[in-house]
């Protein structure tokens, strides 16, 4: 339904964003904002798999807001928007915006935790622990089993975060989790525990006494 029929430069793509976030818990009101690089007459919001736009806004400005009230998990999915002006011609729309992945869930998927280069290290050597989820732009926390507060926090633009453990206090059992960087906070399950040990130390549990 919405294929531009003229030079692409004439119809530059808009930008689609979500407020308060693109990852939210059910019941939250979400506003999807479509921002055009020029004043537009009509904005259309599409969800993947649907031919007809989910919502239309006739506005005559550069920005349109689409309100999704008390979202449910079924409203999660891939969204994009387009805009058009009043004299562009029949069926001519802008290029599609960036794809926005809206995730509506009570709990984010469990991340994986791996050691780089591996879980067995030379005494005194540093080790990097990668906590990897599937969603970019999250806040990651690394825990040492038996210690209540997180060892490290990292805000990452990638769907993973690399935690560097320094030297002699490295051995132990670790886990991580991630969450949305701002309210409303959605947390992941904790990763499976990962045991880090020194070479030649066997499976000695170094968490005791910490």
């Amino acid at each position: 339904d919405f294929t531009p029929t003229a030079p692409l430069a004439s119809y530059p793509q808009p930008w689609l964003g979500a407020h308060p976030a693109a990852v939210v818990t059910p019941g939250i009101n979400v506003t999807l904002t479509c921002r055009a690089p020029q004043s537009a007459w009509r904005f259309a919001l599409f969800k993947s798999g649907l031919v007809t736009p989910l919502l239309l806004r006739d506005v005559s400005v550069e920005l349109a807001e689409f309100f999704l009230e008390e979202v449910t998990p079924a409203q999660g999915g891939s969204y994009h928007c387009r805009y058009r002006k009043t004299d562009w011609g029949p069926g001519v729309w802008s290029q599609p915006s960036n794809v926005l992945e809206l995730l509506v869930t009570d709990q984010l998927p469990r991340p994986s935790l791996v050691a780089l280069p591996g879980p067995v290290v030379a005494p005194g050597a540093n080790v990097s622990l990668r906590c990897a989820g599937r969603i970019p732009g999250m806040s990651f926390a690394l825990y040492r089993v038996g210690v209540a507060t997180p060892l490290q926090y990292i805000d990452s633009v990638q769907p993973w975060a690399d935690f560097l453990l320094i030297g002699t206090h490295t051995p132990g059992t670790y886990c991580c989790y991630y969450h949305t960087p701002s309210a409303p906070y959605v947390l992941s399950q904790r990763s499976q525990p990962l045991v880090i040990s020194f070479e030649g130390s066997g499976s000695l549990d170094y968490t005791q006494g910490n």
Epitope: D1, W41, T52, T86, D87, G89, P90, G91
Partner: antibody
Framework: EVQLLESGGGLVQPGGSLRLSCAAS????????MSWVRQAPGKGLEWVSG????????YYADSVKGRFTISRDNSKNTLYLQMNSLRAEDTAVYYC?????????WGQGTLVTVSS | QSVLTQPPSASGTPGQRVTISCSGS????????VTWYQQLPGTAPKLLIY???HRPSGVPDRFSGSKPGTSASLAISGLRSEDEADYYC???????????FGGGTKLTVLG
């Protein structure tokens, strides 16, 4: 309030000419695509012509191609349809319609009768 | 003959639900959006449904549109006597480079 007012209709002999006008008000005329749609007595709607991209893109129905010319004067907020070589089958009420995509506003129409 | 095919007539009694179909091809309905217009006796057409299923403000939610594939349909629920009118579907045709209408459906409200 959007208003479209057609004028220029009347009785004309086959082979003759007429120029229809559509005076627009209540919106920024120069920003909008416009179209002409006609309706023969007791018949359905037939799209005649459309003007888009500030006049850069113009389309015609095959039935009027080469005989009718659509144009606009943004300074006068007016749409025109110059009709030449008129035929009996051009007899209809001619509507001017605002056409950003769908035809969202229509005039009341002007009757063109082609008869000897 | 119209490019888009509609039944010439439809009827129903007050309160009933009536559906009007509009059949086309890939060059019009299949790849472009469908619009529905209502023309009351002796008046100019009026926009009823645009972009397949969207209602302009002021149009009651008794009117709904859908578009599966190369056909479209207009549904009117809770039929009222004032719904008696001609209904036209329309779409841009990419092959003809022009706008095409259905032949129109005359809706009669019985009783």
């Amino acid at each position: 309030e959007v208003q479209l007012l057609e004028s220029g209709g009347g009785l004309v002999q086959p082979g003759g000419s007429l120029r229809l006008s559509c005076a627009a008000s209540g919106f920024t005329f120069s920003d909008y695509a416009m179209s002409w749609v006609r309706q023969a007595p007791g018949k359905g709607l037939e799209w005649v012509s459309g003007i888009y991209h500030g006049g850069g893109n113009i389309y015609y129905a095959d039935s009027v191609k080469g005989r009718f010319t659509i144009s606009r004067d943004n300074s006068k907020n007016t749409l025109y349809l110059q009709m030449n070589s008129l035929r009996a089958e051009d007899t209809a009420v001619y509507y001017c319609a605002r056409a950003p995509d769908e035809f969202d506003y229509w005039g009341q129409g002007t009757l063109v009768t082609v008869s000897s | 003959q119209s490019v888009l095919t509609q039944p010439p007539s439809a009827s129903g009694t007050p309160g009933q639900r009536v559906t009007i179909s509009c059949s086309g091809s890939s060059s019009n309905i299949g790849n472009n959006s469908v619009t529905w217009y209502q023309q009351l006796p002796g008046t100019a057409p009026k926009l009823l449904i645009y972009y397949n299923s969207h209602r302009p403000s002021g149009v009651p939610d008794r009117f709904s549109g859908s578009k599966p594939g190369t056909s479209a349909s207009l549904a009117i629920s809770g039929l009222r006597s004032e719904d008696e009118a001609d209904y036209y579907c329309g779409a841009w045709d990419s092959s003809l480079n022009g706008y095409v209408f259905g032949g129109g459906t005359k809706l009669t409200v019985l009783g």
